[in-house]
Interface confidence: low
């Protein structure tokens, strides 16, 4: 048997909100479950659909979901069918509607002292409670000769008089929520003695020193009073005008004229009509002074031929809002075509070179006119005046590669060397016309160069190969003065390069030939055993066919290299005693001795009374102090070489002998006894 485990139950529901009717069955076989609404099958929609065997409502609809729902379970095999209990929704809703005139039949029939009934067309379930309003103020029962039933949707005014005139609206609420009238009713019951508006003043905008006119008229029986007020409630009459409204005139028909308007005249003007009965009728209008600000500057624009471009003109702030138009060559642009104005924009469709020039955006209102120019350039692809050419540049001299192009705007030129961008430095310079200057050409400048000339419209490029014509030169140039150690083997190298490999030979400066123990081996001068006679001036000559010859002069000195006869030793001295650091060197030419103490050269002329350097090179320091401690370096040098040796100097306090030590105890370190 088919058993309902969960049956749908009648329930409260809210219009437009979710709901669920549950249905669950248990059966021995496969059961097919569907739903009926008032006996008709329920079709699934996005709003109402089966969910499992339950019926789900995404948004309850008071019209489509009213009725009786029933869950039906059917065993398709046995044909057995079971139906659930009926379930329905108590749908809570509220719907706004207008306020309408129920009595009399038409507005034309409304007369003073007649009964007027208004009906509030807000419906809902449960039945709503109503509240009426006149001009936004709630009305309560029995208020000012009207009968209002808050439970009813009707408002009865009996009798209706001019004091009941106003905008009537209603609101209603129930368990679902609240709604207010979608359209309100204006009740107008004329009272001849009430002031009625015939002509209301309008806001005006005027230029400085111009005139402004406000019109204002009321009607009533007897005729009403009319009065003008400005801003601070100051009355304006032809007899008494406030100081800042000396040029104001009130005409018999109620119009107010202001002449030669000034900024202080701007503001709110109130026209007040007062009838014999009824409240005063206040009408307001504002006088604005026209104004216009300056326009922002345009940046020059560069466009490419064939493209579509737009230039927006931001209108200046102004009152009234300024009108904007574009001009070119003194002619206002049309609103269609290839070059035209659209709104505040200048539109150039399919730009041509002839479109280049100055375009002007104009803005104007009552306060005046402003204009701003924009310069439009139509870019062209560069063309060649002179391409870079393969060049032979001489080493050591300046070299030039040309890249001369023309275009609009003036093209920018960049150069590449071996695909690397050349940045200007001390050796490379790009002139304004695109020419590249290489200052002091070097051998490795021989490579590929490429120039690229560009504008926004496109670019062109060309490349050239540079061959460097190498100059005849010594590589490296021989040192002009060199020393050779007496009685030792020595070599003096000389090498050179040029466009062709040069030949190199040595000769003595006096023209005499080289001794047999001296050989010239491919530019290297070789001394097997240096003698005193080998000293002198020598010349290295490098030559080739196309470039001739070059010479380098070298003065060779024969010397006995420096050796130390006496070197300074590690020395410890008592504070206040004298330190002696000995140093003696020998060599030819005779070496000079210099001392360096604590990382600075000791200048013999600035040593002061405590220090002295002897002829033999020894350094003596009298009355030593702890700050004299440190490393001392003896430097021996002559025109051929230099040598140095160093030793530390320690300055210590003299120890006080203890009782256990006899007077003959040796000092704990090697001392100089002075």
């Amino acid at each position: 048997a088919i058993v309902f485990i969960k049956q749908p139950s009648s329930q409260d529901a809210l219009q437009g909100r979710r709901a669920l009717l549950r249905c669950e069955v248990e059966a021995p076989g496969l059961v097919h479950v569907y739903w009926l609404l008032d006996g008709a099958p329920v079709q699934d929609t996005e709003r109402r659909f089966t969910q499992g065997s339950s019926l789900s409502f995404a948004a309850v609809d008071r019209l489509q979901d009213s009725g009786t729902f029933q869950c039906v379970a059917r065993d398709d095999v046995t044909g057995e069918e079971a139906r659930s209990a009926n379930a329905s929704f108590n749908i809570k809703w509220i719907e706004a509607g207008p306020v309408v005139l129920k009595h009399p039949a038409s507005e034309a029939e409304i007369q003073p002292q007649t009964q007027v009934t208004l009906r509030c067309h807000i419906d809902g379930h449960p039945r709503p409670t109503y509240q009426w309003f006149r001009d936004g103020t709630p009305l309560s029962d029995g208020q000012s000769n009207n009968t209002v039933s808050s439970k009813e949707r009707n408002l009865t005014l009996r009798p209706a008089g001019p004091e009941h005139s106003g905008l009537y609206s209603c609101c209603a609420h129930n368990a679902f929520g609240q709604a207010c009238s979608s359209q309100n009713f204006t009740l107008s019951i004329a009272d001849e003695s009430f002031a009625r508006v015939v002509l209301a003043p309008q806001d005006v905008i005027v230029a400085r020193n111009e005139e402004a006119m406000f019109h204002c008229q009321f009607s009533a029986q007897p005729p009403p009073n009319l009065q003008w007020l400005f801003e601070d409630e100051t009355p304006i009459t032809n007899r008494s005008r406030p100081p800042h409204l000396r040029r104001a005139t009130v005409f018999a028909n109620g119009s107010l004229l202001l002449t030669q308007v000034r900024p202080r005249n701007a503001g709110v003007y109130r026209c007040i009509g007062q009838g014999q009965r009824g409240p005063p009728v206040i009408l307001e209008a504002t006088l604005h002074l026209a104004e216009i600000e300056d326009m922002p500057l345009f940046e020059p624009r560069v466009f490419t031929a064939g493209s579509e471009e737009r230039v927006t003109c931001l209108p200046p702030k102004g009152l009234p809002e300024p009108s904007v138009w574009w001009e070119h060559a003194g002619v206002r642009l049309p609103t269609h075509g290839r070059v035209y104005q659209k709104g505040h924009e200048l539109v150039l469709a399919s730009i041509a070179e002839s479109d280049a020039g100055v375009y002007t955006c104009h803005a104007a209102n009552l306060a005046g006119q402003r204009r701003q120019d924009v310069n439009i350039t139509v870019a062209t692809v560069p063309t060649w005046l002179k391409k870079p050419q393969d060049s032979q540049l001489e080493e050591g001299k300046p070299g030039y590669l040309h890249c001369l192009t023309q275009a609009t705007p003036k093209p920018t030129v960049v150069w590449y060397r071996n695909q690397m961008l050349i940045s200007e430095d001390s050796r490379f310079e790009v002139f304004k016309n695109g020419t590249l200057r290489i200052n002091n050409v070097e051998v490795y400048d021989g490579t590929w160069y490429r120039c690229v000339s560009s504008t926004p419209a496109g670019s062109i490029e060309a490349q050239a190969r540079v061959q460097v014509l190498e100059k005849l030169k010594f590589t490296p140039p021989p040192q002009p003065q060199q020393c050779m150690e007496f009685d030792k083997e020595a070599t003096v190298p000389c090498s050179a390069t040029g466009r062709e490999k040069p030949t190199i030979k040595w000769e003595r400066a006096d023209g005499s030939s080289l001794p047999e123990w001296v050989t010239d081996n491919a530019g290297t001068l070789h001394f097997a055993r240096v003698t005193r006679d080998d000293a002198g001036n020598y010349t290295c000559i490098a030559s080739n066919g196309p470039q001739g010859q070059i010479r380098a002069h070298v003065q060779l000195t024969v010397a006995v290299f420096i050796t130390f006869k006496v070197e300074p030793e590690r020395t410890t001295v008592y504070q206040g005693h004298t330190a002696l650091l000995q140093c003696e060197a020998q060599g030819d030419p005779k070496p000079l001795i210099q001392w360096k103490g604590k990382d600075r050269i000791l200048d013999p002329t600035k040593l002061g009374p405590r220090m002295h350097i002897f002829q033999n090179g020894s350094l003596v320091i009298h009355d030593v102090a702890p700050e004299d401690s440190g490393r001392y370096t003896c430097i021996a040098g002559n025109s051929c070489n230099i040598k140095h040796t160093e030793a530390p100097l320690y300055v210590v306090d003299k120890p006080v002998p203890e009782e256990s030590e006899g007077p003959g105890s040796p000092p704990p370190y090697k001392m100089i006894q002075t």
Epitope: I5, K6, Q11, D12, R17, R18, A19, L20, R22, E24, E26, Q51, G52, S53, S54, S56
Partner: antibody, heavy 125, light 107 residues
Framework: EVQLVESGGGLVQPGGSLKLSCAAS????????MHWVRQASGKGLEWIGR??????????SYDASVKGRFTISRNDSKNTAYLQMNSLKTEDTAVYYC????????????????WGQGTLVTVSS | DIQMTQSPSSLSASVGDRVTITCQAS??????LNWYQQKPGKAPKVLIY???NLEKGVPSRFSGSGSGTDFTFTISSLQPEDIGTYYC?????????FGGGTKVEIK
């Protein structure tokens, strides 16, 4: 008679793992979504996650507090749901219940009318 | 996540008293709310489903109402066997969330 029986609880150290089982009988397990709910001592109920039926691709969903650490699975041939708990923390100490709607695999319309007796998991060093 | 705020957290009333528990959702959940009763050492048991429907076999003194965000659970006449903790639970959206619970005691 419908029955849900949890097992596998016990004492585990922080950072450790534990796997709970939930054996079901007395209803169509394969068509039902299975949920896990826990309750720390003296505290309220906290939903951990659920696994839907095979017809709903065994889709799983977890509470943010356990996502990435806990995994729910099922074996319809054994009528059993599982809760694999890794990287356990002391705040995971609680009684763990498996629960089911019983008749529908549709979880959003679920209320839990079948509950197990619960199994205690203690995470402590 | 939808937060469920249940109050009071505990109450003490006499037998026969009317007891009211409220539950507030942090966003609109329509009527997708259930109420459970849990006795010490036992698993929870559903009393009310879909905010206002009484589960089969549950005494009629238990009732529920509300829709949207504000819900009320009422025991019209408290009985000694009603002691325990009551929880609301939303299932409008995952993760499913429970209220903090209300412990009901007899004076």
């Amino acid at each position: 008679e419908v029955q849900l029986v949890e097992s596998g609880g016990g004492l585990v150290q922080p950072g450790g793992s534990l796997k709970l089982s939930c054996a079901a009988s007395g209803f169509t397990f394969s068509g039902s979504a299975m949920h896990w709910v826990r309750q720390a001592s003296g505290k309220g109920l906290e939903w951990i996650g659920r696994i839907r039926s095979k017809a709903n691709n065994d889709a799983t969903s977890y509470d943010a507090s356990v996502k990435g650490r806990f995994t729910i699975s099922r074996n319809d041939s054994k009528n059993t749901a599982y809760l694999q708990m890794n990287s356990l923390k002391t705040e995971d100490t609680a009684v763990y219940y498996c629960t089911s709607r019983g008749y529908s695999g549709y979880d959003y319309s679920s209320y839990f009318d079948y509950w197990g007796q619960g199994t205690l998991v203690t995470v402590s060093s | 996540d939808i937060q469920m705020t249940q109050s009071p957290s505990s109450l003490s009333a006499s037998v026969g008293d009317r007891v009211t528990i409220t539950c507030q959702a942090s966003q609109d959940i329509s009527n997708y709310l259930n109420w459970y009763q849990q006795k010490p050492g036992k698993a929870p048991k559903v009393l009310i489903y879909d905010a206002s429907n009484l589960e089969k076999g549950v005494p009629s003194r238990f009732s529920g109402s509300g829709s949207g965000t504000d819900f009320t659970f009422t025991i019209s006449s408290l009985q000694p066997e009603d002691i325990g903790t009551y929880y609301c639970q939303q299932y409008d959206n995952l993760p499913i969330t429970f209220g903090g619970g209300t412990k009901v005691e007899i004076k």
